[in-house]
């Protein structure tokens, strides 16, 4: 069976301040079992943007029903975008365990923020 791929189709997304940003992510397999997390940045200091399992993410909603077992779309929407939200966002698949371990990352989507239209 082909190994799971994490696909972020948009290399970049530009959003006007105040609007919502949709960041697309799909996986090509249900195996291995484990959650998806979204991060801003790719190094040790990366910021957690969304965790499918737990956490507090008031501005983030999932585009599809990510809790459904057969779901392979892990796109998210971030509301009320400001210039401080600019950066590169990564969709990352984890393998279930104690603790969960990182399995594969998407290539990243760079979010840029345009000035609010007057």
């Amino acid at each position: 069976e082909e190994e799971l791929q994490v696909i972020q189709p948009d290399k970049s997304v530009s959003v006007a301040a105040g609007e919502s940003a949709i960041l697309h992510c799909t996986v090509t397999s249900l195996i291995p079992v484990g959650p998806i997390q979204w991060f801003r940045g790719a190094g040790p200091a990366r910021e957690l943007i969304y965790n499918q399992k737990e956490g507090h993410f008031p501005r983030v909603t999932t585009v599809s029903e990510s809790t459904k077992r057969e779901n392979m779309d892990f796109s998210i929407s971030i509301s009320n975008i400001t210039p401080a939200d600019a950066g590169t966002y990564y969709c990352v698949k984890f393998r279930k365990g104690s603790p969960d371990t990182e399995f594969k990352s998407g290539a990243g989507t760079e979010l840029s923020v345009r000035a609010k239209p007057s």
Partner: antibody, heavy 117, light 108 residues
């Protein structure tokens, strides 16, 4: 408002241990990597350790094998367990939040650790 | 490992004058450089990042420039509260995080 408050500093002898704590408030602690940075008296800043949001840990060579960083997201608290302390570990230890692009945007006021015989 | 060298070690100036602080990296770091200010008995405060971008609440008399290996922090018209120690830091990839040795700006 973001607040970072360190505690646990004090005077110890070489070879002894100390555990520092940093209580965080005003932001979603579990979403950010956290660091310890130290400053010896009259000297510059030296990064000590980082713990990522997934609890992966990183250390400066000078403390590797002696210091252990950890976090308790349920208590919004960062820790630094310091073992086999040496005179050269004497410093003010700052807890610092780091952004995704490697900026130390918030710092505590620091806690002084003195290692002396 | 990148080394950041700051110069001069101490800068003696009067209020109203311009301060020019240098930070040189031992290898190119693009524009990934930040500056911090530290006053006696206080924690450092982020001033500038990505070489030129002022952090929130930082007055426009502080400006940064440079790229590659040579970077400059300029403080136009020094105010009494600007006398402090300034550190540069590379924002480049992984730990260890590296700080320069600092430049003290003191009153002449």
């Amino acid at each position: 408002d973001v607040q970072l408050v360190e505690s646990g500093g004090g005077v110890v002898r070489p070879g002894e241990s100390l555990r520092l704590s940093c209580a965080a408030s005003g932001f979603t602690f579990s979403n950010f990597a956290m660091n310890w940075v130290r400053q010896a008296p009259g000297e510059g800043l030296e990064w000590v350790s980082l713990i990522s949001v997934t609890a992966t840990t990183y250390y400066a060579d000078s403390v590797k094998g002696r210091f252990t960083i950890s976090r308790d997201n349920s208590k919004n608290t960062l820790y630094l367990q310091m073992n086999s302390l040496r005179a050269e570990d004497t410093a003010v230890y700052y807890c610092a939040k780091v952004t995704w692009n490697n900026l130390f945007d918030y710092w505590g006021l620091g806690t002084l650790v003195t290692v002396s015989s | 490992e990148i080394v950041l060298t700051q110069s001069p070690g101490t800068l003696s100036l009067s209020p109203g004058e311009r301060a020019t602080l240098s930070c040189r990296a031992s290898q190119p770091i693009d524009s990934y450089l930040a500056w911090y200010q530290q006053k006696p008995g206080q924690a450092p405060r982020l001033l500038i990042y990505n070489t030129v971008t002022r952090a929130t609440g930082i007055p426009d008399r502080f400006s940064g420039s440079g790229s590659g290996t040579d970077f400059t922090l300029t403080i136009n018209r020094l105010e009494p509260e600007d006398f402090a120690v300034y550190y540069c830091q590379h924002q480049y990839d992984w730990p260890p995080y590296i700080f320069g040795g600092g430049t003290k700006v003191e009153i002449k």
